[in-house]
């Protein structure tokens, strides 16, 4: 056979998409189906892995390289190398034990994944409430009261720019 | 769909040359090694030639060695078997296979006679 | 070179039988692949690492063994079962192929 031998090793001379038998005068015979080694001088290849149930396949094993899965839809992935898939949720929602539950007053999750998280609060950076928070959007916070003109309320949409001391039309 | 095909077949005289060609798509060329298998009208299949996905490992059967030379291109995903100093005793179907061996191609037909 | 032999080189069953394929190699290999070959058509990866089913196989088939032994079992035969049967070998280089078995309904 045309390959290099290393004096170390002959194993070593044998690439990704093939194993080495020790007991067969180092030979690179090629991983059996369903299975791949992903560098060179391995002795043994890995089995694939299989993408089922909840899991959908992202990419094909091949000799060479392993399968990569993704989650179905309605579900989402977890992990290092999408190892869990977890049920999304609505916006508005996190996911608990007993499924997927509204975000509490006061919490919010604009996503379909992830826990529902407190609304901020402007008052610590010294601003107010521009627009109100929902259990699917956070609130908008905006000038320190003390910015706003007398009589504004706190909580609707500045009006339109106009020249100073003059009142809309 | 995973699809192998051969061509470069047809009749040659002995001590002629040829070059067999296997197109693939559907896969990963480049992530797979990859054989020659051929079939002599009404007998089984022998194993002729494998390299693997990068061309850095290749393997020839004793009955081809020195004569027959397997490579690939892995940017065209094609796959190449050229033989020469051909035989009567080379005139079979000639397959291209998937190391796995899972897919094979529809085959491509060798005659090496006068 | 490992040297694959199978048996019968013909075999006739009936509908509905249940047979037995077998491969004997003249060395030890860690596992056996089985093909099968319908005539005019090229093979098809039918069992894998001795007893893996390749992908769209139906149940009714099954392979064993180890070592220098290997088996193909069809549980209950069926029509379009009429094909050549391979058992092969790539663990030892060269890779090789047993010469067949002929698998005929009555």
């Known amino acids: 056979f045309e390959r290099t031998r290393s004096l170390q090793d002959p194993c070593s001379n044998c690439p990704a998409g093939t194993f080495c038998d020790n007991n067969r005068n180092q030979i690179c015979s090629p991983c059996p189906p369903n299975s791949f080694s992903s560098a060179g001088g391995q002795r043994t290849c890995d089995i694939c892995r299989q993408c089922k149930g909840v899991f959908r396949t992202r990419k094909e094993c091949s000799s060479t390289s392993n399968a990569e899965c993704d989650c179905t839809p309605g579900f989402h992935c977890l992990g290092a190398g999408c190892s869990m898939c977890e049920q999304d949720c609505k916006q508005g929602q996190e996911l608990t034990k007993k499924g997927c539950k509204d975000c509490c007053f006061g919490t919010f999750n604009d996503q379909k994944r992830g826990i529902c998280r407190p609304w901020t609060n402007c008052s610590l950076d010294g601003k107010s409430v521009l627009v109100n928070g929902t259990k699917e959007r956070d609130v908008v916070c905006g000038p320190s009261p003390a910015d706003l003109s007398p009589g504004a309320s706190s909580v609707t949409p500045p009006a339109p720019a106009r020249e100073p001391g003059h009142s809309p039309q | 769909d995973v699809q192998l095909v051969e061509s470069g077949g047809g009749l040659v005289q002995p001590g002629g040359s040829r070059k067999l060609s296997c197109a693939a798509s559907g896969f990963s060329f480049s992530s797979f090694g990859m054989h020659w298998v051929r079939q002599a009208p009404e007998k089984g299949l022998e194993w002729v030639a494998y390299i693997s996905s990068g061309s850095s490992t290749i393997y020839y059967a004793d009955t081809v060695k020195g004569r027959f030379t397997i490579s690939r291109d892995n940017p065209k995903n094609t796959l190449f078997l050229q033989m020469t100093s051909l035989r009567s005793e080379d005139t079979a179907m000639y397959y291209c296979?998937?190391?796995?061996?899972?897919?094979w191609g529809q085959g491509t037909t060798l005659t090496v006679s006068t | 070179q490992i040297v694959l032999t199978q048996s019968p080189a013909i075999m006739s069953a009936s509908l509905g039988e249940e047979i037995t394929l077998t491969c004997s190699a003249t060395s030890s290999v860690s596992y056996m692949h089985w093909s099968q070959q319908k005539s005019g058509t090229s093979p098809k990866l039918l069992i894998y690492t001795t007893s893996n089913l390749a992908s769209g196989v139906p149940s009714r088939f099954s392979g064993s063994g180890s070592g220098t032994f290997y088996s193909l079992t069809i549980s209950s035969v069926e029509a379009e079962d009429a094909a050549d049967y391979y058992c092969?070998?790539?663990?030892?280089?060269?890779?090789?192929f047993g010469g067949g078995t002929k698998l005929e309904i009555k």
């Open positions: 296979v998937r190391d796995w061996t899972d897919y």
């Open positions: 092969h070998q790539w663990t030892t280089y060269p890779w090789t």
